[in-house]
């Protein structure tokens, strides 16, 4: 899997974009996981709605939320206030089962809030020594929380 | 006003590193990816890859990760290219570029000479 | 890697001419598309981006368009100061890539 790396400003919100074919993904789940190292498993973050036909409704799991387009065919991440530690390798997966296929692989870039003129010296990135393969860049605003969308609790 | 300053041309022997800069001022350098792209002598553009300067994290393009290593410094707004175990193939033109949120490289320096030659 | 494809590595134009450049991707990159114009001894310069977004100071006879894997740089009207290579280069995947620049040429 090629990977695709979206950069954000830390403080903003990041939207990322996972485009997948609807018709081969038609009536599966979507989720967004972490993957801890490289080669380490892939934390689940955050899932769409337990009913398929309710997938555009949003989800949230604390800053982070999901829903997706299943006609278009795009699953949509929003990463709100984002932080330095926020940085790192993320997998779009779809679901079937006990299954989850890897749609994208992502890589998510921090970078400073060019207003903000403080020193961010001492702030802690994950894995600075790492490097991942396959990028390509996106920025962009999300909109907040629509009524009729659904928070989803942090899970523990 | 943006200019990214390359560091002057290089004559070098094969075998032999060298490293190679570009200072950023005009802009918050920590706030853009900085790139590295390579031209040999009327040929196309290759992408080596990019140091986040924000994080240090950096992104190589697979077939540059033997051959380069590119670092920043904050308090300096520099980045660098470090180039080792030079050879002919390596004599090219060599540029820094920001990427821009907008995607595409919106700034670039005005390029390193580096020759290998015995 | 995605390879980007430019058809013609040179055409030879006549000043005031409609110029059309094409780029083709090796696969879908979801309009992540870059245009540089590039001048001998010169760095390269962006002219659009995200596929038809022109950038600040780039005159409006240039213009992108293309979705999918086909992309297209215009050229309404051929000046003296456009005759300079022009690039295609993707950003959907790394290793970023670049189309291998098509060289526009006076009659």
């Known amino acids: 899997h090629n990977t695709t790396v979206f950069q954000g400003v830390a403080g903003q919100s990041l939207q990322v974009s996972c485009p997948y074919d609807s018709m081969k993904h038609w009536g599966r789940r979507k989720a967004w996981c972490r993957q801890l190292g490289e080669k380490g498993p892939c934390q689940r973050v955050v899932s769409t709605h337990n009913l398929w036909l309710l997938s555009f409704l949003r989800r949230w799991n604390g800053s982070t939320a999901i829903t997706d387009d299943t006609l278009g065919g795009t699953l949509t991440i929003t990463l709100r206030n984002l932080q330095p530690h926020d940085a790192g390798l993320y997998q779009c997966q779809s679901l079937h089962g006990s299954e989850a296929d890897t749609l994208r692989k992502v890589l998510v870039e921090v970078l400073a809030d060019p207003l903000d003129h403080r020193d961010a010296g001492d702030l802690w990135f994950p894995g600075e020594s790492e490097s991942f393969e396959d990028a390509h860049v996106e920025h962009s605003i999300s909109r907040s929380l629509l009524e009729g969308e659904i928070p989803f609790p942090p899970t523990s | 006003e943006v200019q990214l300053q390359q560091s002057g041309p290089e004559l070098v022997k094969p075998g032999a590193s060298v490293k190679m800069s570009c200072k950023a001022p005009?802009?918050?350098?920590?706030?853009?990816?900085m790139n590295w792209v390579k031209q040999k002598p009327g040929q196309g553009l290759e992408w080596i890859g990019y140091?986040?300067?924000?994080?240090?994290?950096?992104n190589y393009n697979e077939k540059f990760k033997d051959k380069a290593t590119l670092t920043s410094d904050k308090s300096s707004s520099t980045a660098y290219m470090e180039l080792r175990s030079l050879t002919s193939e390596d004599s090219a033109v060599y540029f820094c570029?920001?990427?821009?949120?907008?995607?595409?490289?919106?700034?670039w320096g005005q390029g390193t000479t580096l020759t290998v030659s015995s | 890697d995605i390879q980007m494809t430019q058809s013609s590595s040179s055409f030879s134009v006549s000043l005031g001419d409609r110029v059309t450049i094409t780029c083709k991707a090796s696969?879908?990159?979801?309009?992540?598309l870059a245009w540089y114009q590039q001048k001998p001894g010169n760095a390269p310069r962006l002219l659009i981006s995200?596929?038809?977004s022109l950038e600040t100071g780039v005159p409006s006879r240039f213009s992108g368009s293309g979705s999918g894997k086909d992309y297209t740089l215009s050229i309404t009207s051929l000046q003296t100061e456009d005759v300079a290579t022009y690039s295609c280069?993707?950003?959907?995947?790394?290793?970023?890539?670049f189309g291998g620049g098509t060289k526009l040429e006076i009659k």
């Open positions: 570029a920001r990427s821009s949120y907008r995607y595409g490289f919106d700034y």
């Open positions: 005009g802009y918050s350098f920590t706030s853009y990816l």
């Open positions: 140091i986040n300067p924000y994080s240090a994290g950096s």
């Open positions: 696969e879908d990159i979801y309009n992540r």
């Open positions: 995200g596929a038809t």
């Open positions: 280069q993707q950003y959907w995947s790394t290793p970023w890539t």
